[in-house]
């Protein structure tokens, strides 16, 4: 048997994000003897399901089968027959369930009931599907990035695993953005918080961590939107509004009862005399940016610096990955190198917003129009968000690196979730074993 | 636009067996998902069974084990087979094809199609 590998005990892990946009499933595989190892578990496999966010099938409930058979069938076949039954499945719903949720608890048990009787009709060792808090999102996305990056690892590597990797320890902050809710997360300078409720102790892998978290419901980037457009139609004077977050040329209807069916849009709520109102872009990113920052409520703070609408944030420290929507519209708008700065990004977006919607629409011809024309306005609410509602300045800036994947895994949650749930994160340090599996005999 | 015709309805003994029919035509390339739906007298609208674009199915509780949908995209038609019909089978049984909207606005769906029905009667 010499030269002859051992062979691997692969183990395997589903997580869905039942995110407000969308659904995606992943799946994760470790080899078994090293599950408590650090880096180890990786994702093979993303599948998006067709369609919106669960919360949207709330008047179609008998559909939620059919909407997660195609991943779940991916998730078949990926997966090794002779591990179905091990592999467990966790389902986390995000800030667009907490959103249902607040508008009727029972419409928002009734989608997880189903949810949890479809996934409970395959082969896989189903454990459960929840509404994590904001809280459980931002520890969970901290967690993931830091264990991929290799922050965990009491080892010290002479090289790096991924381009912005430094060989020292200090964990990267995490900043999130979805489609209802943004979250930051770090490690500040100072142990003592202001605000036990954004306080986070963990104990991972031996060491001791004191996080700050936060998850700004309704700051997500469509419900951003919306309480834009319900800001900005208070003070329009007939059924058009002249936004300058969207391309010169650019023409949308939109139906008031759309607009105030989210709790987010509920403060701006007014009767209105008229049932639908036309969007009319300008395009002028200065413009839009100030609209923008009517979102944040930077007038009253209880602590010695807040982030916006009274809530306590401590001065930055470190390193921050930004990923989800922060990463995919930075992405489009090709603003995610290092090397561009703060102001290289403000002017690349004053130029971008500026362009002709029938332009845009030659130069992105393959993208869908309801997300084209959407990036001007997403592209002003990353850079308001993080200048002016986190305090990142010019300088800091650099500090920020926009990450989609690490080591071909996705940045987000749900690694760090099932990370959690499977005790695969020990609070010590493992005592390294002589012969990994895959020593030679 | 699309049309969908329904086919194959009728009495059947309980216990028996039925193949419903719906072939599609016109503008199909936007249909991912397409479903019999049914309503018995004086009740609602039930699914009954779906099948998507990959053909991965999906079934009431009720019909499980019983009825089998199946697609034919060489053909833009899709079938339910349906063995072991009881009495509570009875119904007038519809065709729907469709595609979901990927936006949070809006309709659920981004198209929707209907055929006509046709009548399925489990009786001795």
């Known amino acids: 048997t010499q030269n002859k590998a051992l062979p691997e005990n692969i183990k395997y892990g589903i997580v869905l994000d039942a995110g407000s946009s969308h659904t995606s499933l992943y799946i994760y595989k470790w080899p078994a003897e090293k599950e408590n190892d650090t880096g180890v578990v990786h994702q093979v496999e993303e599948c998006r399901v067709k369609g919106p966010g669960i919360s949207k099938y709330v008047q179609k409930v008998n559909e939620i089968g059919i909407y997660l058979t195609d991943c779940m069938e991916r998730a078949r076949e990926v997966i090794p027959r002779s591990q179905h039954q091990e592999t467990p499945v966790y389902l986390g719903a995000t800030a667009g369930m907490r959103l249902l949720r607040m508008e009727s608890e029972e419409l928002a048990d009734r989608v997880l009931d189903v949810v949890e009787r479809s996934l409970s009709n395959y082969p896989f060792d189903f454990q459960g599907a929840r509404i994590i808090t904001g809280q459980e999102e931002g520890a969970y996305g901290w967690i993931t990035i830091n264990y991929l990056l290799g922050k965990f690892s009491q080892k010290t590597r002479w090289f790096s695993i991924v381009p912005y990797e430094t060989n020292n320890q200090e964990t990267f902050g995490a900043l999130d953005l979805g489609g209802a809710s943004t979250q930051i997360t770090f490690v500040p300078q100072n142990q003592t918080t202001e605000s036990p409720d954004n306080a986070l102790q963990f104990r991972l892998y031996g060491k001791d961590y004191n996080v700050y978290t936060h998850s700004f419901l309704c700051y997500g980037k469509d419900q951003a939107l919306w309480q834009k457009l319900a800001k900005d139609i208070q003070v329009a004077s007939n059924e058009i509004l002249r936004d300058p977050c969207f391309h010169p040329g650019y023409k949308k209807v939109v139906n008031v009862s759309d607009l105030y069916k989210t709790p987010c849009t509920k403060r701006f709520e007014m009767t209105l005399p008229f049932q639908q109102f036309e969007i009319q872009g300008i395009g002028n990113y200065q413009q839009c940016h100030q609209s923008v920052l009517e979102l944040f409520n930077t007038s009253y703070c209880p602590y010695s610096q807040c982030a916006f609408n009274g809530i306590f944030l401590p001065p930055l420290q470190g390193d921050f990955g930004a990923f989800s929507a922060f990463y995919f519209v930075m992405n489009f708008l090709n603003l995610t190198s290092e090397k561009v700065s703060q102001e290289k990004v403000t002017e690349m977006m004053k130029k971008f917003c500026s362009q002709p919607w029938e332009e845009i629409k030659t130069s992105y011809a393959g993208v869908k129009e309801k997300y084209l024309s959407e990036y001007c306005f997403s592209g002003t609410y990353i850079l308001s968000l993080l200048l002016q509602g986190y305090h990142f300045t010019a300088d800091s800036w650099e500090h920020i690196h926009f990450i989609g994947k690490i080591q071909g895994s996705d940045a987000g949650w749900t690694l760090g979730y099932m990370l959690n749930l499977t005790n695969m994160i020990p609070a010590e340090q493992p005592l390294s074993t002589p012969l990994s599996h895959s020593t030679y005999v | 636009e699309v049309q969908l015709l329904e086919s194959g309805g009728g009495l059947v003994q309980p216990g028996g067996s039925l193949r419903l029919s719906c072939a599609a035509s016109?503008?199909?390339?936007?249909?991912?998902?397409m479903s019999w739906y049914r309503q018995a007298p004086g009740k609602g609208l039930e699914l009954v069974a779906a099948?998507?674009?990959?053909?991965?199915?999906n079934y009431a509780d009720s019909v499980k084990g019983r009825f089998t949908i199946s697609r034919d995209n060489s053909k833009n038609t899709v079938y339910l087979q349906m063995n072991s019909l009881r009495a509570e089978d009875t119904a007038v049984y519809y065709c729907?094809?469709?595609?979901?909207?990927?936006?949070?606005?809006?309709?659920?769906?981004?198209?929707?199609?209907w055929g006509q029905g046709t009548q399925v009667t489990v009786s001795s």
């Open positions: 016109g503008d199909i390339f936007s249909i991912n998902y």
């Open positions: 099948i998507t674009g990959r053909g991965n199915t």
């Open positions: 729907n094809a469709w595609d979901y909207s990927d936006y949070d606005e809006g309709p659920l769906r981004e198209y929707d199609y």
